[in-house]
């Protein structure tokens, strides 16, 4: 008889058929399961109190241009011994100058430029994401220069202003992703590959779907754009009974694939290959790895039965992916 | 047992239409492509196209474009492909043929359905 | 779309002689499968990736090639071996078949 047949190339692109959510799994709500992860939100990110902040310069206005004492050269790292007697009161030293808001605000918004500066050395690439985008943008107009002095004088600010602006780039947002299981037993006939399907979503803490493209009925995942996907299945099975009541032979073994566009060879897939010879007669087998798809291009699981024995896949096995990257 | 079943054959008027089936059986109707080939008389094989049952994509040569639609029922385990404003040109063994999931190729091939247009 | 030239059209061999069929390809290509047909039955697989027998295929026949060309041969023809054999690529739509070759045993 033939060989269980064969994998491909792009195809013509089609909406999924009906069945894109259903069926749910037990005890889930049309609304879907409740726990998901949250969308990130630009605003919840990074956020500083601006009155904080401003607060926190002005409790400092005795550095930078209001410091009583302008540090030249290098800054001197601070050493703390024992603290000695307290010394004789000063002179009553002359009126300090009366500084305006608008020069406190502009020595502000230059430590803000150095802050962001900071995070641009630090930063490979310049992150577009996050918050500093915009500041770094507003505070372009301002004329004056900050000199090496005002590096050295506003350390403590910069602690304070350059951890929330700039704390490494932000991890980016997955825009596609899925957590699916197997919603009943599957039989595999022996010698037969098997394309697991009807899957469903877990209602539970930690189980997420992002994105269109996942087709729970048909068990086929669309990808909604051309990137790199991790992809990952565990399928519990349960050995049946082999014929005449032998033990699997040496040559008895189960291939898991995650392939493209059901061709598990012309197109890249990943195969994970499990003799049975030492099995129990329940076992869990995994497969995962990184493939590239194509938008519309789909995959799904296969269970390829190399061995004399029927066998059952176990409700409750998944299938899972997440967008990487494109 | 896995087998394609075609009908015979079928001789149809110019002009006219024309539905040709393919009855798969012994195996997951759903999860393989199959193919649909021609072949005139003494010639060689001439690829029309592709259909998925599951996904339902299709690929067609673009010769075939306009004159060969494919279909499925997978509540029937059924491939067709619709022939229409049928020529002497059309006049050919049909075949459908299976192409595996784990190898490269056409798997399974049935018998082939032989069309013959004439008034 | 690629063009699969087979040669010779038609061959004729004697039981025991080794035949070496061909195939050449008008740009590379990934994968050659090989159909045999005799006279009035539907294409059977023969060869498949290069160089895989189907299943109840003689070991008297190999497949090998690599980019624009491919060969079937069979080390020793017998009688039953008569039929004509095309080649196929799977590497681009739309998938193309060889003109065929047609062997004969004397």
């Known amino acids: 008889s033939p060989e269980p047949g064969a994998p491909s190339r792009s195809r013509a692109r089609r909406e999924p058929p009906p069945g894109n959510e259903l069926p749910r799994g037990p005890g889930e709500s049309r609304a879907g399961p409740a726990a998901r992860p949250p969308e990130p939100t630009a605003e919840r990110a990074h956020s500083v109190d601006p009155r904080d902040a401003w607060m926190l310069f002005v409790r400092q206005s005795d550095k930078g241009v209001n410091g009583k004492k302008r540090s030249r050269g290098k800054a001197k790292k601070l050493k703390f011994g024992l603290p000695g007697p307290p010394g004789p009161p000063g002179p009553q030293g002359p009126p300090g100058p009366i500084i305006p808001p608008e020069a406190l605000l502009k020595e502000f918004q230059l430590l803000l430029k150095g802050a962001v500066r900071q995070r641009e050395r630090a930063e490979p690439e310049p992150c577009t994401c996050g918050p500093a985008g915009p500041v770094a943008a507003s505070l372009a107009p301002v004329s004056a220069t900050a000199g090496e002095d005002d590096d050295d004088v506003v350390g403590d600010v910069l602690a304070l202003l350059a951890a929330p602006l700039a704390p490494g780039p932000r991890a980016p947002r997955v825009e596609a992703a899925f957590l699916c299981r197997l919603r009943r037993d599957a039989l595999v006939e022996r010698r037969a590959l098997h394309e697991l399907g009807v899957y469903y979503l877990p209602d539970a803490e930690g189980a997420f779907r992002r994105g269109p493209g996942l087709n729970l009925t048909s068990g086929q995942y669309r990808a909604p754009v051309a990137g790199f996907y991790a992809l990952a299945a565990t399928l519990h099975v349960a050995l049946g009974e082999p014929p005449r009541r032998g033990p699997p032979r040496p040559r008895d073994h189960l291939r898991l694939l995650i392939c493209i566009q059901s061709r598990c060879q012309r197109n890249a897939s990943l195969e994970a290959i499990m003799g049975l010879e030492s099995s129990s007669e329940l076992f869990t087998i995994s497969v995962n790895g990184v493939l590239y798809l194509q938008m519309g291009q789909w995959t799904s699981v296969f269970l390829d039965n190399a061995s004399g024995c029927s066998l059952t896949v176990r409700s409750g096995s998944h299938f899972s992916a997440v967008l990487l990257g494109v | 047992q896995v087998q394609l079943q075609q009908p015979g054959s079928v001789l149809v008027r110019p002009g006219a239409s024309v539905k040709l089936s393919c009855k798969a059986s012994g195996y997951t109707f759903t999860s393989y492509w199959m193919h649909w080939a021609k072949q005139r008389p003494g010639q060689g094989l001439e690829w029309i196209g592709e259909?998925?049952?599951?996904?339902?994509?299709?690929n067609h040569n673009e010769k075939f474009k306009g004159k060969a639609t494919l279909t499925v029922d997978t509540s029937s385990n059924t491939a067709y492909v619709d022939l229409s404003s049928l020529t002497s040109e059309d006049s050919a063994v049909y075949y459908c043929?299976?192409?595996?999931?784990?190898?490269?190729?056409?798997?399974?091939w049935g018998a082939g359905t032989t069309v013959t247009v004439s008034s | 779309q690629i063009v699969l030239t087979q040669s010779p059209a038609i061959m004729s061999a004697s039981p025991g002689q080794k035949v070496t069929l061909t195939c050449s390809a008008s740009s590379s290509v990934s994968y050659m499968n090989w159909v045999q047909q005799k006279s009035g039955t539907s294409p059977k697989r023969w060869i498949y990736d290069t160089s895989k027998l189907a299943s109840g295929v003689p070991a008297r026949f190999s497949g090998s090639g690599s980019g624009t060309s491919y060969s079937l041969t069979i080390s020793s023809v017998e009688a039953e071996d008569a039929a004509t054999y095309y080649c196929?690529?799977?590497?681009?739509?739309?998938?193309?078949f060889g003109g065929g070759t047609k062997l004969e045993i004397k």
């Open positions: 196929q690529q799977w590497s681009s739509h739309p998938y193309t």
């Open positions: 043929a299976r192409e595996g999931i784990t190898t490269v190729g056409f798997d399974l």
């Open positions: 259909i998925h049952p599951k996904s339902g994509d299709t």
